[in-house]
């Protein structure tokens, strides 16, 4: 009778193992193992008894005693079983990014490992099991569905695997994949609100808004403005829910033209994008022309008015006629003219919108000087001691310098209050002079002298 | 003992395709992976690509990718690697190799190979 | 795709001397799990090839004791400690870490 110790051994990959073979037989013509694993054997007194180290054990076998006595052969087998972690335990790729509401599906591949009969594949969240199966296949393969929550933001995804060796006196051993970090988001299906202006002057400055509501997580939240080619840069601020980006624009002669304004709002692997249209346009304040801005009395003057070739102009009101970009008046300069005020209105349809500008000039008309009764009485009559201001007005453009002299020499003080004496009595000669020439006025000072009784 | 058997050498012409059979024998054939691997004279060893036995899930090289198809009959213990619009530079032999799915413990038995030559 | 490159090309080695073969990777062979797939194969003239190296130094089954591997990141060495008559054929390295699998050039040993 042949037999073997130990007739089972689990041993890791690569192991070896002591096999001791027997015979019940003193006088065994033959005692040996069968086996294609590398063996050595140990020298051992009697010739019923061998021990061999079988190495390099890489896969299960079944090596074999055999003995040959008298009364016969026989053979004895040892369940080697060899045992070895999974080499690959990973989760298939998955975009980090899901949307909440959508079904995740999580396959967890494993290469390797025995024996399977004791390997199970646990797929997990966190520590929570969501599903257990036994190893089967190469790669065994194990999957589950996952509704995403919001509530799943954040949460590790894992698959581990258990080769439970307890049973055979080892112990459990463990293999965890790297984790999947999920990260969840709400988009919602409407579109960010854009805010701007629809025309923009070329050289000037607009606010841009761009706002949305309903976004899981805000923060995660990516927001791109660009006016045409331009990218803007906003202010983001965010709510709970919701941000508001704002953003400066300013455009240039290059941009003119009709420009497409987006905003695009990108969360996880999707994005909400606006589109609008804004007309930058070029429209500089008419041009008011005076022939000379600074004329002598009864010249004639030319105003014209010129704007954009598409805008249409009011000179002081009055419509260009033929309706159109020109204007013009033609007066001839009175010193009523002078300080007159013309005015260009110009109007130019910017995409729907009317859009105006104003530009003033004013007409400087040289005259004088003038010297005249209304404000320059001939003749004054006051009692003596009597409290007086002589009152003389030049007109003129420019005003004129004004000098009232007697015998040339002693002047009435203009404008000033004088206690009149009988000095003061007399003919004036008064003199207005300015660039535009001189005159001169004669007045008279006349001093009654109180009546003694 | 383990053994892989493939089909006899093959001679194409250039366009045509090829039907390579490995046939497994002394495991369970459900437990192992098969890759196909070939040979070109005075190349080095080409990886082409993989199949699961047992679900039938494959992986190809990039190179190889819409002119192999692997696939296998679980019933008769067999894998196939058919080639198509065959060029002359797809001489070789190839190779099915029992393995792991991702061969981290290398390919540890091989067929014997077969010979393909595509000639006009 | 990771290059594999061997050297020498040819090695030529008196019976019963050590022989000593080269690998190296183009990129880390260390996959994220911290494990090495780094293979070492023996092809005989006229035969398929045959594993004896596994994971940069594990004996396949039934391979002589006088075959060991080293090496890691880049850098692998295939060692046999005394060469014998049926050591001689090609040898190659090949990696299973990043995909495509890939195989070194191959080393032909042969007796002097």
């Known amino acids: 009778q042949t037999s073997v110790s130990p007739s089972k051994v689990i041993l890791p990959r690569g192991g070896s193992v002591l096999v001791t073979c027997s015979t019940s037989c003193d006088q065994p013509k033959l005692l040996g193992i069968e086996t294609p694993l590398p063996k050595k054997e140990l020298l051992l007194p009697g010739n019923n008894r061998k021990v061999y180290e079988l190495s390099n054990v890489q896969e299960d076998s079944q090596p074999m005693c055999y003995s040959n006595c008298p009364d016969g052969q026989s053979t004895a087998k040892t369940f080697l079983t060899v045992y070895w972690t999974p080499e690959r335990v990973e989760l298939a790729p998955l975009p980090s990014w899901q949307p909440v509401g959508k079904n995740l599906t999580l396959r967890c591949q494993v290469e390797g490992g025995a024996p399977r009969a004791n390997l199970t594949v646990v797929l997990l969240r966190g520590e929570k099991e969501l599903k257990r199966e036994p190893a089967v296949g190469e790669p065994a393969e194990v999957t589950t569905t996952v509704l995403v929550r919001r509530d799943h933001h954040g949460a590790n995804f894992s698959c581990r695997t258990e080769l439970d060796l307890r049973p055979q006196g080892l112990e459990l051993f463990e293999n965890t994949s790297a984790p999947y970090q999920l990260q969840t988001f709400v988009l919602p299906a409407t579109p960010p609100q854009l805010v701007s202006p629809r025309v923009l002057e070329v050289d000037t400055q607009g606010t841009v808004v761009c706002s949305l509501d309903g976004l899981f997580p805000v923060s995660e939240a990516q927001v791109h403005l660009a006016l045409g080619d331009q990218r803007l840069n906003p202010t983001v601020t965010y709510g709970n829910d919701s941000f508001s980006a704002k953003a400066s624009v300013s455009v240039t002669a290059e941009d003119e033209g009709t420009q497409r304004l987006t905003c695009a709002v990108i969360l996880g692997n999707q994005s909400q994008e606006t589109l609008q249209t804004v007309t930058i346009y070029s429209f500089p304040a008419p041009n008011v022309i005076l022939t000379k801005p600074e004329v002598s009395e009864g010249t004639e003057v030319t105003v014209k008015c010129e704007a954009h070739p598409r805008a249409k102009v009011t000179l002081n009101g009055v419509p260009a006629q033929p309706l159109g970009p020109r204007a013009q008046l033609l007066l001839k300069a009175t010193p009523e003219d002078n300080g007159r005020s013309f005015s260009c209105s110009a109007t130019l349809e910017v995409a729907g919108q009317l859009i105006h500008k104003n530009q003033t000039r004013e007409l400087r008309v040289l005259y004088g000087p003038r010297l005249d009764e209304r404000d320059c009485p001939g003749n004054w009559t006051w009692p003596e001691n009597s409290q007086q201001t002589p009152m003389c007005q030049a007109w003129g453009n420019p005003l004129p310098e004004l000098k009232c002299l007697k015998d040339g020499t002693f002047p009435l003080p203009i404008g000033e209050s004088v206690t009149v004496t009988r000095d003061l009595e007399g003919t004036y000669l008064c003199r207005a002079r300015s660039t535009q020439g001189e005159v001169t006025r004669k007045v008279t000072v006349n001093v009654l002298s109180p009546r003694y009784e | 003992q383990v053994q892989l058997v493939q089909s006899g050498a093959e001679v194409k012409k250039p366009g045509a395709s090829v039907k390579i059979s490995c046939k497994g024998s002394g495991y369970t054939f459900t437990d192992y992976a098969l890759h196909w691997v070939r040979q070109a004279p005075g190349q080095r060893l080409e990886w082409i690509g993989v199949i699961s036995t047992y679900s039938g899930n494959t992986d190809y090289n990039q190179k190889f990718r819409g002119r192999a198809t692997i696939t296998r009959d679980t019933s008769a213990s067999t894998a196939y690697m058919e080639l198509s619009s065959l060029r002359s530079e797809d001489t070789a032999v190839y190779y099915c190799?029992?393995?792991?799915?991702?061969?981290?413990?290398?390919?540890?038995?091989w067929g014997q190979g077969t010979a393909l030559t595509v000639s006009s | 795709d990771v290059v594999l490159t061997q050297s020498p090309l040819s090695l030529p080695v008196t019976l019963g001397q050590p022989a000593s073969i080269s690998c190296r990777s183009s990129q880390t062979l260390v996959y994220r799990n911290g494990n090495t797939y780094l293979h070492w194969y023996q092809q005989r003239p006229g035969q398929s090839p045959r594993l004896l190296i596994y994971?940069?130094?594990n004996r396949f089954s039934g391979v002589p004791d006088r075959f060991s591997g080293s090496g890691s990141g880049t850098d692998f060495t295939l060692k046999i400690s005394r060469v014998e008559a049926e050591d001689v054929g090609v040898y190659f390295c090949s990696q299973n870490t990043h995909f495509p699998y890939t195989f070194g050039g191959g080393t032909k040993l042969e007796i002097k």
């Open positions: 190799a029992r393995s792991l799915y991702f061969g981290s413990s290398g390919f540890d038995y």
């Open positions: 994971k940069v130094s």
